[in-house]
């Protein structure tokens, strides 16, 4: 670092402002130094002496240049349905985000205050809109010709298999059952899974949209923590 030149508070030009990382102290009527992140003002400046800064205590922080008399307290420890994505340090608050399979029902400035488990669509219903970090799964009834036989927060409605001869017709919660001759499918067999939302601040999954339903067959369920609605399970 270059040779230190001690800062002396100064009166700003008439109509002027203090420099960046300085503040105007109303009592001293001078431009004085702000304290850097991780520190706070221990002693405020006077006309002849600059701000005296001190490090933040454990479990407290300041994220910005400041002249606060006390550092801010870090948030409480993350709850069991959350993961700590940023630890509490002298320069940053703890950040808690929801773990996989959960979404943030009540967010705060950074991270999440309250997590809720993602809704599971019951048999006969598939995922119309997948869950994200901040929104719940939306279920829809399976349209004619499609079914879902699972209780899942990721499975969409799949087409019935097409039989040469149908033994048991399919319905919204069950695939068609064919006689012994081999069936064909309008789509590849096997459940289609939508990705779980990623519980980090930097990644956002872009799941592929579910196949559109017949007109008038989709409906939306309320987003956010709510009693189990039709088509969803409350576990």
């Amino acid at each position: 670092l270059p040779a230190q030149v001690a800062f002396t508070p100064y009166a700003p030009e008439p109509g002027g402002t203090c420099r960046l990382r300085e503040y105007y102290d109303q009592t001293a009527q001078m431009c004085c130094s702000k304290c850097p992140p991780g520190q706070h003002a221990k002693v405020f400046c006077t006309k002849t002496s600059d701000t005296v800064c001190d490090s933040c205590e454990d479990s407290t922080y300041t994220q910005l240049w400041n002249w606060v008399p006390e550092c801010l307290s870090c948030g409480s420890r993350c709850s069991s349905d959350q993961v700590e994505t940023q630890a509490c340090t002298r320069e940053q608050n703890r950040i808690c985000t929801c773990r996989p399979g959960w979404y943030c029902a009540l967010s705060k400035q950074e991270g999440c205050r309250l997590c809720a488990q993602l809704r599971k669509c019951r048999p006969g219903f598939g995922v119309a809109r997948p869950g994200t970090e901040t929104s719940d799964v939306v279920c829809k009834p399976c349209a004619p010709g499609t079914f879902s036989n699972t209780t899942s927060s990721t499975d969409i409605c799949r087409p019935h298999q097409i039989c040469h001869v149908v033994a048991i017709p399919g319905n919204a919660s069950m695939d068609a059952v064919c006689t012994s001759t081999s069936p064909t499918r309008s789509m590849a067999p096997g459940a289609v899974h939508l990705p779980q939302p990623v519980s980090t601040r930097s990644q956002h999954t872009q799941p592929t949209p579910a196949p559109s339903t017949a007109p008038g067959t989709s409906f939306l369920l309320p987003v956010g923590p709510s009693p189990p609605a039709e088509g969803s399970t409350g576990d």
């Epitope: 002027g16 420099r19 990382r21």
Partner: antibody, heavy 123, light 107 residues
Framework: QVQLQQSGAEVVRPGASVTLSCKAS????????MHWVKQTPVHGLEWIGA????????AYNQKFKDKARVTADKSSSTAYMELRSLTSEDSAVYYC????????????????WGQGTTLTVSS | DIVMTQSQKFMSTSVGDRVSVTCKAS??????VAWYQQKPGQSPKVMIY???YRYSGAPDRFTGSGSGTDFTLTVNNVQSEDLAEYFC?????????FGGGTKLEIE
């Protein structure tokens, strides 16, 4: 090593706006203020304004308050300056420069400069 | 605004000579003054800060002096690579202001 890489020369029409960029590397971008300076043969070096990338706080020379707007993007370590309502008077070389200014010191000199962006305003 | 005046626009000197560039502030700026060297087609480079502290990258033939309103940049044993324009700058208060520059010409 510290480098400030500025965007290329611009030729623009009067009345238009332009945004110049300054990408920083070799140091922690948010630790230092970024300042912008204009240079012309007639007026020499003129301080336009500055930004603290950590907070987004800005300061301007009154002369350029309605002309320039400085911003910074911490994620890409890039500072920007938008110049509005351009006239031939705005034709100049514009520099971004890092300020050494730090707590407890009156030091505030410019230790690293970009290579400059030449702006020509012409119809 | 604080006006920084460099009264000499050009100064002529010879290799090996000593030359002094002056700068006057319109009001007291303490020692909050820096000197920059700018060679043709290049960006400015800091040579002196806080009126008298030599920047780490500057040759030791460059010295600065002064406080309050009168400042001097002295180049001892001038070299051909010192051919450049020199600017003073005050950083006491916003808006930061520069002198008009003094071009050093080598005879």
């Amino acid at each position: 090593q510290v480098q400030l890489q500025q965007s290329g020369a611009e030729v623009v029409r009067p009345g238009a706006s332009v945004t110049l960029s300054c990408k920083a590397s070799g140091y922690t971008f948010s630790d230092y203020e970024m300042h912008w300076v204009k240079q012309t043969p007639v007026h020499g070096l003129e301080w336009i304004g500055a930004i603290d990338p950590e907070t987004g706080d800005t300061a301007y020379n009154q002369k350029f308050k309605d002309k320039a707007r400085v911003t910074a993007d911490k994620s890409s370590s890039t500072a920007y300056m938008e110049l509005r309502s351009l006239t031939s008077e705005d034709s100049a070389v514009y520099y971004c420069t890092r300020d050494i200014h730090y707590y407890g010191s009156s030091l505030s000199y410019f230790d690293y400069w970009g290579q400059g962006t030449t702006l020509t305003v012409s119809s | 605004d604080i006006v920084m005046t460099q009264s000499q626009k050009f100064m002529s000197t010879s290799v090996g000579d000593r030359v002094s560039v002056t700068c006057k502030a319109s009001q007291n700026v303490g020692t909050n003054v820096a000197w920059y060297q700018q060679k043709p087609g290049q960006s400015p480079k800091v040579m002196i800060y806080s009126a008298s502290y030599r920047y780490s990258g500057a040759p030791d033939r460059f010295t600065g002096s002064g406080s309050g309103t009168d400042f001097t940049l002295t180049v001892n044993n001038v070299q051909s690579e010192d051919l450049a324009e020199y600017f003073c700058q005050q950083y006491k208060t916003y808006p930061y202001t520069f002198g008009g520059g003094t071009k050093l010409e080598i005879e």
